[in-house]
């Protein structure tokens, strides 16, 4: 049914869905703090622009009686139930922030007449790509895929002179929400990644992964997995690894690698870590003081969602335009706004762009070092270390297929 929006006469409301099922196990109190901190900043920015308006957030909680798995498995119905609650209360804001689960976002987008923008901290899956009124503020799977294909094809760097066309993907079903959808995208037979590779096999059992490490008949030297170093250690332990194996560890939302006192454990020597470039320190902000480095990005995405709304509200008000229009709903894309931690760029489809960083372990210093960075906005690689101290022979990444001729 048509729900009236609390979105005019100088009063602008943000509907924040506080779902029990979330992409990250983050206490809702922390997300509330992030939203409230964002509201303070937005109010200040609007005031500085001479716009005398009120901006508030309404937090919509689900009852939690039925949908209590805590992860994203039962989020589909929870999202729709919350929308029904909004509908019954006849109270909808100018913008909807949340949900973060791919299942719920997809279903909510499908089942509603979306004449308002939806901002998500998550919704990583390919099924949430190219949605006209959806904005995603954490790197979606599509961005990861484009990096990987680009890196696989690269053969003109002094440390990577072979194009790769093969890969194993380790996916055992216990992944976090972000990892689940990242690996799901790599596994999908119709995805860009699968289309560009000649050989790809998904390893689902620990033993399969462990056997590949020393299998002379393996079909690829490259294994992609998702998680932190501890996750890899649980799986790999101190097992011997063939010298031309390369493990790509996707760990986007973890800035521990950049901390000064971090030493890379020995089991990381044949691993390249893909993570996001850390922002300026968030440690002093009230909302992030209690957050682990991994969770910081999630809370930050909520906060940036508020700042994005404030940015768009300011533009529309300054231009004398109506907020409750399809034009406003479709405007949250192809722009750069001032986020909490610096400029945030959204692509043509409303997905956040970022700088991905590929790290290696220096055999000299046992520290993580930046090998290259990748700007998802322009799909461009920026080499950083032209003479990396790799564990691999000749300080070059090996061929992806053992026994191919020299290059």
């Amino acid at each position: 049914s048509q729900v009236s929006q609390n979105c005019h006469n100088g009063s602008y409301e943000i509907s924040v869905l506080m779902m029990g099922n979330s992409a990250f196990a983050e206490p809702l109190k922390n997300l509330e703090d992030a939203v409230n901190e964002g509201l303070e900043i937005v109010r200040g920015r609007l005031q500085n622009a001479g716009l005398n308006v009120t901006v508030n957030a309404t937090f919509m909680y689900s009852d939690g009686l039925i949908h209590n798995s805590g992860d994203c498995r039962s989020s589909t119905c929870e999202g729709l139930d919350l929308l029904r609650k909004i509908s019954n209360a006849q109270r909808m804001g100018c913008v909807l922030i949340g949900p973060s689960c791919t299942y719920s976002t997809f279903q909510m987008y499908l089942d509603t007449e979306l004449s308002y923008p939806m901002i998500s901290a998550g919704s990583f899956g390919l099924s949430c790509d190219y949605k006209e009124t959806l904005t995603r503020l954490m790197s979606p799977a599509r961005k990861l895929m484009y990096f990987l294909v680009n890196f696989w094809k690269t053969n003109d760097l002094p440390f990577k002179t072979y194009s790769w066309s093969t890969s194993y993907v380790y996916k055992n079903g216990t992944e976090t929400e972000d990892c689940f959808w990242y690996l799901n995208a790599l596994e999908a037979s119709v995805s860009y990644f699968s289309h560009e590779l000649g050989f790809k096999v998904v390893l689902r059992q620990d033993k399969e992964f462990q056997d590949i490490l020393m299998d002379h008949n393996r079909k690829s030297n490259v294994i992609i997995m998702c998680g932190g170093p501890e996750f890899l250690y649980k799986l790999k332990g101190d097992r011997a690894v063939a010298e031309d194996i390369v493990i790509i560890l996707v760990d986007l939302f973890n800035d521990q690698y950049f901390e000064d006192n971090v030493t890379a454990p020995d089991y990381m020597k044949n691993v390249l870590v893909l993570t996001l470039s850390p922002g300026n320190s968030l440690l002093n902000s009230s909302f992030s003081r209690n957050l682990s480095p991994t969770k910081r990005d999630f809370a930050l995405a909520y906060l940036n969602g508020i700042l994005l709304f404030g940015h768009m509200l300011k533009i529309f008000l300054e231009n004398g335009e109506n907020i409750t229009t399809p034009k406003f709903a479709h405007a949250f894309r192809n722009l750069t706004f001032e986020g909490y931690d610096g400029p945030v760029t959204l692509d043509d489809w409303g997905d956040v762009d970022s700088t991905m960083v590929l790290l290696y372990t220096s055999v000299d210093t046992k520290k993580y070092k930046v090998l290259l960075t990748y700007d998802t906005h322009v799909n461009k690689t920026y080499p950083v270390d032209m003479s990396p101290t790799f564990t691999w022979k000749n300080s070059k990444l090996p061929n992806d297929i053992t026994g191919r001729g020299p290059q």
């Epitope: 053969n155 003109d156 002094p158 002179t161 070092k369 920026y382 950083v384 270390d385 032209m386």
Partner: antibody, heavy 118, light 106 residues
Framework: EFQLQQSGPELVKPGASVKISCKAS????????MNWVKQSNGKSLEWIGV????????SNNQKFKGKATLTVDQSSSTAYMQLNSLTAEDSAVYYC???????????WGQGTTLTVSS | QIVLTQSPAIMSASPGEKVTISCSAN?????IYWYQQKPGSSPKPWIY???NLASGVPARFSGSGSGTSYSLTISSMEAEDAATYYC?????????FGGGTKLEIK
């Protein structure tokens, strides 16, 4: 417009040190590696080293280890190369050159002429 | 390190003549890059990744090759093409340049 503006010619005595500068403009300085290249009189080009302005990562040609020290100043978008213990062999034109991967050395400074003579 | 040998070291060509400059590597490389330098000027990128012309380079230039053997070709020599041409590799660290080919106009 992209530009790499190098410091002027230097005449120095043997045993001394010199610091050559290369000021970048027209692009994001921290995004691109900066290379240094030596060209002795009428001779070919010799690569000295490269520095990444964002992370400070340096890769040197072994031949110039101990001879050349590369640094950057992000605030002024300037790269520097210090050459020490100078001898007549170090007399040459020195160029800074930006990388724009996959096009290596895509923009060059105008060159700095160094003359080492007593 | 990889050694690049250019031949000839010096050559002259008449206007309209086809010119080929060779660059030979002592070890296989994936790509070669070419630079043009005129007296008193900095080198200019001319051809990158073996066969891609840099911005502003006339279409009479082309590059080709693979493995250890590469070449730069001018289909029809013009006076403004007189310069020294250097090949360069970044397949292995450190990057190295060839000794240069000085091309003169007859």
């Amino acid at each position: 417009e992209f530009q790499l503006q190098q410091s002027g010619p230097e005449l120095v005595k043997p045993g001394a040190s010199v610091k050559i500068s290369c000021k970048a403009s027209g692009y994001s300085f921290t995004d691109h590696n900066m290379n240094w290249v030596k060209q002795s009189n009428g001779k070919s080009l010799e690569w000295i080293g490269v520095i990444n302005p964002k992370y400070g990562t340096i890769s040197n040609n072994q031949k110039f280890k101990g001879k050349a020290t590369l640094t950057v100043d992000q605030s002024s978008s300037t790269a520097y190369m210090q050459l020490n213990s100078l001898t007549a062999e170090d007399s040459a034109v020195y160029y800074c050159a930006r990388d724009d991967y996959p096009n290596y050395f895509d923009y060059w400074g105008q060159g700095t002429t160094l003359t080492v003579s007593s | 390190q990889i050694v690049l040998t250019q031949s000839p070291a010096i050559m002259s060509a008449s206007p309209g003549e086809k010119v080929t400059i060779s660059c030979s590597a002592n070890s296989s490389v994936n790509y070669i890059y070419w630079y043009q330098q005129k007296p008193g000027s900095s080198p200019k990128p001319w051809i990158y990744r073996t066969s891609n012309l840099a911005s502003g380079v006339p279409a009479r230039f082309s590059g080709s090759g693979s493995g250890t053997s590469y070449s730069l070709t001018i289909s029809s020599m013009e006076a403004e093409d007189a310069a020294t041409y250097y090949c360069q590799q970044y397949h292995s660290f450190p990057p190295t340049f060839g000794g240069g080919t000085k091309l003169e106009i007859k």
